[in-house]
């Protein structure tokens, strides 16, 4: 037989069990279903996530945060994180169209132990696991990362979403559902099955926000606070502990009825003790407060700890570090973790991209470049140093090595280096063509003051970066403007190449520069570049335009410089033409045979409307 005192203890035990039930199992579960991951629409989409034809497989990670904290660096995945299983192995089939990629089976489930916040942020990452012969096992790399902020009520239908990350597209659905006995849009109301006892004990009102009828959701009084109120009968509004008023919107600093955790009612005559340490519930993240003789104690839900349950207990096993961050934590499953973020990311979960250039580290107007692994400053003329902090002197007392000349301008200086040298003082050997500066197959030729590009047919621009007809840039129409049908299509050699070849073949000592102005020679074939007295055909000599066009034909491109009108002609026969500057000198001695011939041995000159010249382009 159970004594009345024992009966009271049992009742209170039942009360506590009901109250702490949400702490021992989740209030609900966020579920994410990935439908497809693959190349998005439009050009430039990747063919396959697998590199170098190695087999690979995908997996996904999701991080959930309450509220609108998608990019808040200080917030961890407070609602939880989950890692999917590995998907089926995929190997790219050469020539096959890019498919939607095989996905892991099942849902990603993130249990949440506190109320569902209604508004949440997500980060979904798609990872690639390469299964080649890597030393040390598979290699992982982040393929795509999407983030968003959404409003979602628990218990609602699946919501569909499409997110794009670069050239990839991710299609997915998500929902939040409550785990019994929790119900409601926030999973905060508890539903008691019909078979459960209807009262906690003799003479006591229900001690937790329980609904009598699980199958028929109650309609509480209009305006009843969904966070702090509940109802047992339709039209009722009963308040959780710490709240009062007809709609449970007024906070009170009192404990209530019998159970330290039980709800109070604004309409019931409960015994009201004085203020206690648990008033206002100091326990965060769904922790339960119990009074102790000196203070209070928080019983924390799984995943949180600390005096007030304020510390997230997500562990490295949950995969909380994003963007390749390294997770470091103790062996104890409940120990905390720290994410060591790669360069360019910060935040407790490495979820926030750092715009390191926003700190404006480059001084004196330098351009900041965030390369991920490092910052670089591209300095304005006249400044140098890792952060452009050095204001360079002018040319006074400054020597440029290896035949370089110092050029002043605006208080700054630079060395204009001779061919093959570079650096601030021209002390470094440099190959200006090493960086492959000519686009679309253009040929690069090193030159006194840099380089010049000989463009492939159909391209133009200082670096051959502009296709003339992009729809068929690699093959011009049957007869490009300025070429007769049947003429061979060739790379047009930039005039500056003459100097380069001359220097290489004959040596600088053999290059006789005859600087004098005279008329057009009859033996055009003996010159590197034949001149023509009539400017009927022009070729743009610095490869700004490598298509020859009939003057006035209106169907070919030309440079912004009018090559038919020298702007300055000095008395020594050196033509100075506006940017890019061109220096033309006559060559008296024939150094080479004609560069190439056309049909039937007919000489086809590289035409230029000045005395036959070797050109260098600045």
């Amino acid at each position: 037989m159970v004594s009345p005192r024992m009966s009271g203890l049992l009742s209170q035990t039942v009360i506590l069990a009901l109250i702490f039930l949400p702490q021992t199992r989740p209030a609900g579960v966020f579920e994410l279903q990935i439908h497809s991951f693959g190349p998005g629409p439009g050009p430039g989409a990747p063919r396959s996530p697998c590199s170098a034809r190695l087999p690979c497989r995908l997996f996904f990670r999701v991080c959930l945060k309450p509220g609108l904290s998608e990019e808040a660096a200080e917030s961890p995945c407070a609602l939880g994180a989950a890692l999917s299983a590995r998907g089926p192995v995929y190997t790219e089939q050469p020539g096959a169209p890019a498919p939607d990629l095989p996905l892991p089976d099942g849902l990603l489930q993130v249990p949440f132990r506190d109320a569902w916040p209604g508004t949440f942020s997500f980060i979904i990452e798609t990872w690639r696991e390469e299964l080649g012969d890597q030393i040390g096992g598979p290699a992982w790399s982040l393929l795509a990362r999407v983030a968003g902020r959404r409003r979602l009520a628990a218990g609602g239908p699946w919501a569909r979403d499409i997110q794009r990350a670069g050239a990839w597209e991710l299609r997915f659905s998500y929902r939040a559902r409550c785990e019994p006995p929790a119900v409601g849009t926030a999973c905060t109301r508890l539903c008691r099955p019909r078979s459960a006892p209807s009262r906690c004990g003799p003479g006591l009102r229900p001690c937790a926000p329980l609904e009598d009828e699980c199958e028929a959701p109650l309609v509480c009084r209009a305006g009843c606070s969904p966070e702090h109120g509940f109802c047992e009968q339709p039209g009722e509004c009963r308040c959780l502990e710490g709240w009062t008023g007809p709609l449970c919107t007024v906070p009170v600093s009192t404990s209530s009825c019998l159970s330290p955790r039980g709800p109070s009612s604004a309409t019931t005559g409960c015994l009201v003790p004085g203020p206690g340490p648990c008033d206002g519930n100091p326990c965060a993240n769904g922790g339960s407060c119990s009074e102790t003789p000196r203070s209070f104690e928080c019983t924390c839900p799984r995943g949180f700890y600390g005096l007030r349950c304020e510390v997230s207990g997500v562990t490295c096993a949950d995969g909380p570090c994003f963007n390749g961050g390294l997770c470091v934590g103790g062996a104890d499953p409940d120990s905390a973790y720290i994410c060591h973020c790669p360069p360019g990311f910060q935040g407790s979960n490495c979820e926030k991209r750092v715009d390191r250039c926003s700190l404006q580290p480059c001084r004196n107007g330098g351009l900041c470049l965030d390369l991920g692994h490092a910052l670089r400053c591209r300095c304005r003329a006249g400044f140098a140093g890792p952060r452009c902090e050095h204001d360079l002197d002018d040319c006074a007392g400054r020597a440029c090595a290896n035949g370089g000349t110092c050029v002043e301008g605006g208080g700054a200086h630079r060395c204009s280096c001779a061919l093959g040298f570079g650096g601030r003082d021209c002390r470094e050997r440099a190959d200006p063509c090493a960086a492959r500066p000519c686009a679309h197959g253009g040929r690069c030729y090193a030159h006194f003051s840099g380089l010049v590009c000989a463009c492939a047919p159909g391209y133009m621009g200082a670096r051959c970066e502009f296709p003339v007809h992009p729809d068929g840039a690699s093959a011009l129409p049957a007869a490009p403007p300025g070429l007769r049908p049947g003429d061979p299509q060739r790379y047009l050699l930039p005039p500056a190449l003459g100097l380069l070849v001359a220097a290489g073949v004959a040596g600088a000592a053999l290059l006789l520069v005859h600087v004098r102005r005279r008329g057009h020679s009859q033996d055009a074939g003996s010159r590197l570049l034949a001149g023509t007295p009539e400017p009927s055909v022009h070729a743009l000599p610095d490869a700004l335009n490598n298509l020859r066009t009939q003057e006035g034909s209106g169907d070919g491109p030309s440079s912004s410089v009018d090559w038919n009108r020298p702007e300055d002609v000095d008395p020594q026969g050196i033509y100075v033409i506006s940017a890019p500057s061109i220096y033309a000198r006559e060559v008296a001695t024939p150094l080479f045979p004609p560069l190439h011939t056309g049909r039937a041995g007919q000489r086809q000159h590289l035409l230029f409307p000045y005395p036959s010249s070797i050109l260098s382009v600045k």
């Epitope: 470049l369 621009g461 670096r463 912004s560 940017a579």
Partner: nanobody, 117 residues
């Protein structure tokens, strides 16, 4: 990925003027070579004007002296000032960028210019 958005197209009378703008999403436009192309109905797309990273410009012969290409790196934009417009300038004008870092060309969606009285 560089996104290019053209604006400024529309209907203009022969002899009139129009300025096309192209805004690039990249914050390093000074490292992009930029150009304007056009495509008239039934014709191939063709280069109108281009401007290299060093500021040197190239023009299609038929627009030389009438069109001017310019760039404003601070605004991540390139412009095409079109004067003395003719009926044969009617076309869809496309912005083009060449990304030297990746040897990658990018195209805008195009803006229609109609020259008609």
């Amino acid at each position: 990925e560089v996104q290019l958005v053209e604006s400024g197209g529309g209907l203009v009378q022969p002899g009139g003027s129009l300025t096309l703008s192209c805004a690039a999403s990249s914050s390093s436009v000074q490292y992009l070579s930029m150009a304007w192309y056009r495509q008239a109905p039934g014709k191939k797309r063709e280069l109108v004007a281009g401007i290299s990273t060093d500021g040197s410009a190239v023009y299609f012969d038929s627009v030389k002296g009438r069109f001017t290409i310019s760039r404003d790196n601070a605004k991540n934009s390139v412009y095409l000032q079109m004067n003395s417009l003719r009926a044969e300038d009617t076309a869809v004008y496309y912005c083009y960028a060449y990304n030297w870092s990746y040897a990658q060309p990018y195209w805008g969606q195009g803006t229609l210019v109609t020259v008609s009285s």
